[in-house]
């Protein structure tokens, strides 16, 4: 972004920012914008919240166009009302082991996080909390309407999930990598993060990747076949180019996206992989960003609940990154 030209702002008055989000000047000192928050995409024009000690981390010098809002080295984390030091590990509940790193929290589930899809022997799986047990377990409900169970169920299969091996040891380093977090946006381009020490120095580091669960403009409910309640992985008719803050992917991609349900279930990525995508900007600059690509999606009732911070973080997370 060239800041040498005259300042002109959008025709609307200054935006109203959500509670806790600062109203700041853009990176050119021109226009008032709502500051980007931890983990959000940022540019020179869309700066991070300085009152929370955030800066726009552009990664490699070649990518000085779009970054991710990152806390300064050593920044503490506020999680569930408690302040944790950077580098501190803590068990947030019996279900999660978490680590604070430079203002970001990465957690590894201590319970099985598999997604159970309907099958002939268990057509209505449901997770329930059993007395005296921390981790929820799957139970099979009886169908309310027998006519639903039929030959169509043969199309369902139980999908495995692949996560990092938490006990991997390499050269005196216990390699630990948290799951990729849920995509920050339910539609359109977002950010997914994780914490890992899978590097030469065995130091904890934050990794981020772009993600798109589904395009915002797609009206997916229209594609649900008659008699069905979900469209798990809708077919995208033509290859698409990804857009990121005015920059466009150099290649076209026949990407898979997750669909929607009409019965209250949510469809989320089940197996994913991470690949580099090159974006070309209007000024000719090329930048490379890692991006999540969906292999399979799952539709389930484990939708994020506002009442449970962990469920919202981890039931929607990207299972089994196969990169």
């Amino acid at each position: 972004q060239n800041c040498s030209g005259p300042c002109r702002c959008p025709d609307e008055p200054a935006p109203r920012c959500p509670a806790g989000v600062s109203l700041v000047l853009d990176g050119c000192g021109c226009c008032r914008v709502c500051a980007k928050q931890l983990g959000e995409l940022c540019t020179e024009r869309d700066p991070c919240d300085p009152h929370k000690g955030l800066f726009c981390d552009f990664g490699s010098p070649a990518n000085r166009k779009i970054g991710v809002c990152t806390a300064k080295d050593g920044a503490p984390c506020i999680f569930g009302g408690t302040v944790y030091r950077s580098g501190e590990s803590f068990q947030s509940s019996c279900k999660y082991q978490c680590t604070c790193l430079d203002g970001a929290v990465g957690c590894m589930p201590l319970c099985s996080m598999d997604v159970r899809l309907p099958s002939p022997d268990c057509p209505f799986p449901r997770r329930v909390k059993l007395p005296g047990k921390c981790c929820e377990e799957w139970v099979c409900d009886e169908p309310k309407d027998q006519t639903v169970v039929g030959p169509a169920l043969a199309a369902y299969r139980l999908e495995d999930t692949f996560g990092p091996d938490p006990t991997m040891i390499r050269a005196n380093c216990l390699v630990q990598t948290t799951e990729w977090s849920a995509c920050s946006k339910t539609c359109g381009m977002g950010i997914s993060t994780r914490v890992t020490n899978d590097n030469a120095s065995c130091r904890l580091e934050k990794q981020s990747r772009l993600c798109m669960v589904r395009p915002c403009e797609a009206d997916l409910e229209e594609n649900i076949k008659k008699g069905k309640k979900c469209i798990r992985t809708p077919k995208i008719s033509k290859p698409i180019k990804f857009e990121l803050s005015g920059c466009t992917s150099m290649k076209t991609y026949r990407a898979k996206f997750c669909g929607v349900c009409t019965d209250g279930r949510c469809c989320t990525p089940h197996r994913t992989t991470t690949l580099p995508v090159e974006f070309k900007c209007p000024d000719g600059e090329v930048m490379k960003k890692n991006m999540m690509f969906i292999k399979t999606c799952a539709c389930h009732y484990n939708c994020p609940g506002d009442n449970d911070i962990f469920e919202s973080l981890y039931y929607r997370k990207m299972y089994g990154d196969m990169a």
């Epitope: 030209g5 300042c7 025709d11 008055p13 000192g29 021109c30």
Partner: antibody, heavy 119, light 111 residues
Framework: EVQLVESGGGLVQPGGSLRLSCAAS????????MAWVRQAPGKGLEWVAN????????DLLASLKSRFTISRDNAKNSVYLQMNSLRAEDTAVYYC????????????WGAGTTVTVSS | VVMTQTPLSLSVSLGDQASISCKSS???????????LEWYLQKPGQSPQLLIY???SRASGVPDRFSGSGSGTDFTLKISRVEAEDLGVYYC?????????FGQGTKLEIK
């Protein structure tokens, strides 16, 4: 009523200094950029400088940058133009103007204050 | 960016149409893709007042007999039915590139 009132003009010798003030009323001052525009006797309009909402960014006519400074005090609803090393060619009526920073530039103007640089 | 106005003076009868041209030495499209071309009127003994902004948008309180048009480097201000109160000097102005610049002015007189 939206109003801009300039003051501080007068007769000054070449090499001297003046500080122009502009008092704003009738609008939320910190929601607008402010600007100075001048007009030499019998001549056209010339943009001098403008300043953003909080004073953290200022833009001035390149030829005046070393001698002129624009600033603002939002608590006092005022914008200022500090003019140093004045020359005869700086003789003009200096207008204070409100800059919307959005669609249009100068939607409200003051009546102007006259600066005469002469020995 | 040099803004050149023609004619430099214009004499019209009341009720007639007046047209003023403004040419810029280069394209005045801002990096945000808007064109910040404005027209100001300075009546005798008064401060300038905004008439038109962003090429063709009328400022608040400006009569609809004033209209602006153009693109790229060529712009025009038209007054469809000139009234006595319209006399004065008209300036075009570009705010897309530094330095912000005004045209030299067109003096409108009533015949």
């Amino acid at each position: 009523e939206v109003q801009l009132v300039e003051s501080g003009g007068g007769l000054v010798q070449p090499g001297g200094s003046l500080r122009l003030s502009c008092a704003a009323s009738g609008f939320t001052f910190s929601d607008y950029y402010m600007a100075w525009v001048r007009q030499a006797p019998g001549k056209g309009l010339e943009w001098v400088a403008n300043i953003n909402y909080y004073g953290s960014r200022t833009d001035l006519l390149a030829s005046l940058k070393s001698r002129f400074t624009i600033s603002r005090d939002n608590a006092k609803n005022s914008v200022y133009l500090q003019m140093n090393s004045l020359r005869a060619e700086d003789t003009a009526v200096y207008y204070c103007a409100r800059d919307t920073s959005r669609g249009s530039y100068f939607d409200v103007w003051g009546a102007g204050t006259t600066v005469t640089v002469s020995s | 960016v040099v803004m050149t106005q023609t004619p430099l003076s214009l004499s019209v009868s009341l009720g007639d149409q007046a047209s003023i041209s403004c040419k810029s030495s280069q394209s005045i499209v801002h990096y945000n893709e808007n064109t910040y071309l404005e027209w100001y009127l300075q009546k005798p003994g008064q401060s300038p007042q905004l008439l038109i902004y962003k090429v063709s948008s009328r400022a608040s309180g400006v009569p609809d007999r004033f209209s602006g048009s153009g693109s790229g480097t060529d712009f025009t201000l038209k007054i469809s039915r000139v009234e006595a109160e319209d006399l004065g000097v008209y300036y075009c102005f570009q705010g897309s590139h530094f330095p912000l610049t005004f045209g030299q002015g067109t003096k409108l007189e009533i015949k």
